[in-house]
Amino acid sequence: PKQTLPKPIIRAESTYMVPKEKQATLCCQGSYGAVEYQLHFEGSLFAVERPKPPERINGVKFHIPDMNSRKAGRYSCIYRVGELWSERSDLLDLVVTEMYDTPTLSVHPGPEVTSGEKVTFYCRLDTATSMFLLLKEGRSRDVQRSYGKVQAEFPMGPVTTAHRGSYRCFGSYNNYAWSFPSEPVKLLVTGDIENTSLAPTDPTFPDSWDTCLLTRETGLQKDLALWDHTAQN
């Protein structure tokens, strides 16, 4: 029998990239009957929430107002049932954006290419930064990193219709503080007709799957099974 509770799932509501001075919302999904959830930031306690009533709710939301570089970093959460704590969730990287300047994104040979052509994106930012990030809208977890003093290049290799979509880039002042996003560049890949149906237009920011899936029990639980989730010795 287990002596630990399942680890919770931590998510960012809407997006993990939060413009400065805006509110971030993180969700911690644990178990029905959990008494308390703790949000930890860089290993230290950051916030506590208690679901009301605990037996009807399987998680909580943590609101982080006025986002800034001091609040950007690695978050995790834990919860307890009775006095037993769960394992820690996986780490979530929360990024603050709209810091300082706006980079320029361009694509070579151009925004309209044929399937199989080699494509390179260029991200340029004149202020002091060495890391650049390229994101495809709707795929914001798939961040490509590249390094350069003022400009970085992102070679894509031979493209397919799966590469179609809007791209933005950021300059990064550290792992968790990013510039304003560039204006989007829409890559249109023609040809390769038989694969076209496999590459629908991507959703725009924020990622549609990057949401909080907290649920509320409608009926009263007939027992407190969760209290007996763990062995007593």
Partner: antibody
Framework: QVQLVQSGAEVKKPGASVKVSCKAS????????MHWVRQAPGQGLEWIGY????????EYNQKFKDRTTLTADKSTSTAYMELSSLRSEDTAVYYC??????????WGQGTLVTVSS | DIQMTQSPSSLSASVGDRVTITCRAS??????LAWFQQKPGKAPKLLVY???NLADGVPSRFSGSGSGTDYTLTISSLQPEDFATYYC?????????FGGGTKVEIK
């Protein structure tokens, strides 16, 4: 079976520190929190705080936060509570208590700490 | 901090009596309440957790009830070994706090 065995009684002078140990056996030490509770003579129960031996994370009753340090040694399955700047009103029996999904399910036998000049 | 107010502070009863002890929290604790029994010179023993659940090995004459802010421990038929002090305790937030105790004495 689960056992929490505490160190013996202590007599201390005001201003001194005391460190009480609690050796756990019969379960996986790192899977459960260890709480500390005290009881002054003829009085009720007062929660001091807890430690998660797995992570070392601690949480304290604000009343004791400045004077109490909770630690745990995973290699010996032993939890410790150190109380500094002792005063006469700290005279009490100190208990270590395992925290489980059912709350405070196993208690140590208690350690009497007497503070007297 | 959540205050736990226990009543009565003491009571006298005879073997076979039905005994009821109440505990009131200063705010809703959502059934996150435990009851303990303590005999002189001994550590407390867990009787009830999550307001209504009997701990392992606790006789069925003990029962817990209540929700929100008001909770009750009932001993349906008092036995000689039940003369002791009883405490309620919440574990809804920090700090965990205990009621002041109810001493059950022989009439």
């Amino acid at each position: 079976q689960v056992q929490l065995v505490q160190s013996g009684a202590e007599v201390k002078k005001p201003g001194a520190s005391v460190k009480v140990s609690c050796k756990a056996s019969g379960y996986t030490f790192t899977s459960f929190t260890m709480h500390w509770v005290r009881q002054a003579p003829g009085q009720g129960l007062e929660w001091i705080g807890y430690i998660n031996p797995s992570s070392g994370y601690t949480e304290y009753n604000q009343k004791f936060k400045d004077r109490t340090t909770l630690t745990a040694d995973k290699s010996t399955s032993t939890a410790y509570m150190e109380l500094s700047s002792l005063r006469s009103e700290d005279t009490a029996v100190y208990y270590c208590v395992r925290g489980s999904s059912r709350g405070f399910d196993y208690w140590g036998q208690g350690t009497l700490v007497t503070v007297s000049s | 901090d959540i205050q736990m107010t226990q009543s009565p502070s003491s009571l006298s009863a005879s073997v076979g009596d039905r005994v009821t002890i109440t505990c009131r929290a200063s705010e809703n604790i959502y059934s996150n309440l435990a009851w303990f029994q303590q005999k002189p010179g001994k550590a407390p023993k867990l009787l009830v957790y999550a307001a209504t659940n009997l701990a392992d090995g606790v006789p069925s004459r003990f029962s817990g009830s209540g929700s929100g802010t008001d909770y009750t421990l009932t001993i349906s038929s008092l036995q000689p070994e039940d003369f002791a002090t009883y405490y309620c305790q919440h574990f809804w937030g920090t700090p965990r706090t205990f009621g002041g105790g109810t001493k059950v004495e022989i009439k």
